[in-house]
């Protein structure tokens, strides 16, 4: 669909991130403690047999759960699948664990811990050593760092095998900062609240996170119902009532990991006009390069035209005119009753020159293969490391 | 418990690592910082390590320490100390611990300091 | 860069009266503060977290409010053991802020 150009499809982004295939090196593979070298962080590379054939922790994870098994992606990555193995060891190997639980970090100082749409934070392991066990995460996280936490229900001896899969984050969204979706009350409640969003919230407002409006799932024409299943109505969009806003507008932040050059903002938007939802009626976008520098020059308006009248969920193309900032903040103003967002992405591209927010710790990243990269992603591009692996169904136990 | 180690008088150039020692807790669940206090002065924030092994360090600190870690030891390197860096060397443990979902970095339990030199 | 303004430099109290001191974040800070007091010789000792919440085994008569940019610590019913120097300090919680200790303000308790 033409019109969804800047957002990303996350079935495509599936791609093995380098455990298996070694592109992952030893020196970003570590742990909070190992039974003996020989069962090393740096041994627990899915369908590896090196060393005693898997990772296994020093200390119980049983009752604590405080033992982990940590890998650097370096670069920002979405990661949207995990896979699991036990210790084979040649047929020698009996530990695996039955579950285990993720932390991520974008930056290697704040954990957030992996929950699925429900809330879960526990997902089901392995049954054997051998086997691999395929979790399809939804959500989907944004990470540098992930961590294994394995679990046990007594004390017992477990061994880690693993791998990650996804692609780069290109987009360079950091987080976004927006007032807390609300409830829409119909026939029944819609509940537009932006439920997987990892920052913090402090009197309705969410800030230093990422959440449903960068997890490129595009919300349908009815906003009542759901691309995904065994969810609440509302559960796709990010909304707003008219009413609780007397400026006329809601304002978003959005910070990025280093200077970019923005050609334009596409914001997908519900125009249910039947049931109050309105596309906004202008938008306008502040820049700035630093947190604690002023704002630059004029603002970038951009009013809305065309089919107002199309009930149709579209994305909106907001141009912002090749702006230099690391720092975006929008207003989106309200035409009708409701404002409701499923997915917001930017077309960029970064400023030479420019070092990334995080740090300095963020080593120049190679494509997979040497080449050009992909062109058909913007805020993503593809690693194509290998072959995609192939997800368990909906409905099995780890999908 | 967390102690600093290794501050001495040194000349201007003459790179020094002040170490910090802990015990209790595990370096592997714990961010630590390092602040310093020069004489008289107020409290001035240099780097961190966070459990995670990454390091950030103050804007004007960049370039001039580094930060690393063992499993039970921090080490602060001054990479080359001038006659400003004369100072009381804190060593801190970040108070969350890292699974937490509360992420600021408040610091509960604090090493006596360690006193650096520099003079020629 | 993220700089924390604290006033006065020094406040004089007797003792059970009260002190305000005020800390002001050049951007937003949220609820990411914290307040430490320092006596001589001594390092810091944590008072006050997330702008409000008390440390365990710290008095009550010590309360921090504030969010945003501007940040107050009250210590009330003051005691001659109060006599330190009081610190903010900015709690990290993106790419946009880092670390940062204030001034300092010196409390005299007479």
């Known amino acids: 669909d033409a019109d969804m150009k800047g957002h990303f499809d996350p079935a495509k982004c599936r791609y093995a991130l380098g455990m298996q295939d070694r592109t992952i090196p030893d020196s970003d593979i570590s742990a909070s403690s190992s039974w003996s070298d020989s069962t090393a962080a740096r041994h627990s590379r899915l369908e590896s047999s090196d060393g005693d054939g898997a990772w296994c922790p020093a200390g119980s994870v049983f009752p604590k759960e405080e033992e982990y098994l940590q890998v650097d992606l370096q670069r920002l990555h979405l990661v949207a699948l995990v896979g699991t193995q036990g210790r084979h060891a040649g047929g020698l190997g009996k530990e695996f664990s039955r579950s285990y639980r993720l932390r991520y970090s974008r930056d290697g100082r704040r954990w957030m811990g992996w929950k699925d749409r429900w809330g879960q934070e526990v997902i089901s392991g392995n049954e054997d050593p051998e086997g691999v066990v395929l979790k399809d995460l939804g959500p989907p996280m944004v990470a540098r760092l992930v961590r294994f936490y394995p679990r046990a229900d007594r004390v017992m001896s477990v061994c880690l095998r693993v791998e990650l899969y996804g692609c780069l984050w290109r987009d360079g969204l950091l987080s976004y900062t927006a007032p807390v979706g609300q409830t829409m009350y119909l026939s029944e409640a819609v509940y537009l609240n932006d439920s997987t969003y990892d920052g913090h919230t402090v009197g309705g407002l969410q800030y230093g996170g990422l959440g449903q409006l960068a997890d490129g799932v595009v919300g349908l024409d009815d906003f009542r119902k759901s691309q995904e299943l065994r969810v609440w109505p509302g559960y796709d969009y990010v909304g707003w009532s008219n009413h609780s806003f007397s400026s006329g507008y809601v304002e978003m932040e959005f910070e990025f990991d280093r200077l970019r050059a923005f050609q334009a903002m596409q914001v997908h938007c519900n125009n249910m006009h039947t049931l109050g939802a309105r596309l906004p009626g202008g938008v306008e976008c502040r820049f700035r390069r630093g947190p604690a520098m002023a704002w630059e020059g004029e603002p970038m308006r951009h009013n809305l035209g065309g089919n107002l009248g199309d009930p149709r969920a579209r994305a909106v193309s907001v141009p912002l005119g090749g702006r230099v900032a690391r720092f975006l903040q929008c207003r989106f103003l309200f035409a009708g009753p409701w404002l409701l967002f499923s997915e917001i992405s930017f077309i960029s591209d970064v400023v030479n020159n420019s070092s990334p927010a995080l740090g300095g710790t963020f080593p120049p990243a190679p494509w997979w293969p040497p080449g050009p990269p992909p062109t058909n992603f913007s805020s993503l591009e593809l690693e194509p490391r290998g072959q995609q692996p192939v997800a368990k169904a909906e409905g099995s136990p780890t999908a | 418990s967390v102690e600093e180690s290794g501050g001495r008088l040194v000349t201007p150039g003459t790179p020094l690592t002040l170490t910090c020692t802990v015990s209790?807790?595990?370096?592997?669940?714990?961010?630590m910082t390092w602040v310093r206090q020069a004489p008289g002065k107020g409290l001035e924030w240099i780097g961190i390590?966070?459990?995670?092994?990454l390091t950030y360090f103050a804007t004007w600190a960049k370039g001039r320490f580094t930060i690393s870690k063992t499993s039970t030891t921090v080490d602060l390197k001054i990479t080359s100390p001038t006659t400003e860096d004369t100072a009381t060397y804190f060593c801190?443990?970040?108070?969350?611990?890292?699974?937490?979902?509360?992420?600021?970095?408040?610091?509960?339990?604090w090493g006596p300091g360690t006193l650096v030199t520099i003079s020629s | 860069e993220l700089v924390l303004t604290q006033t006065p430099a020094s406040v004089s109290a007797a003792v059970g009266g009260t002190v305000t001191i005020n800390c002001q974040a050049s951007q937003n800070i949220y609820s990411n503060l914290a307040w430490y007091q320092q006596k001589p010789g001594q390092p810091p000792k944590l008072l006050i977290y997330g702008a409000s919440n008390l440390e365990s085994g710290v008095p009550s008569r010590f309360k921090g409010s504030g969010s945003g940019t501007q940040f107050t610590l009250t210590i009330s019913d003051l005691e001659c053991d109060d006599a330190a120097t009081y610190y903010c300090q900015s709690g990290y919680y993106s790419s946009s802020t880092d670390i940062a200790f204030g001034g300092g303000t010196e409390v005299v308790v007479k």
């Open positions: 801190a443990r970040g108070m969350w611990y890292d699974d937490s979902d509360d992420y600021e970095d408040y610091f509960n339990l």
């Open positions: 209790g807790f595990s370096l592997s669940r714990y961010a």
């Open positions: 390590i966070g459990s995670s092994g």
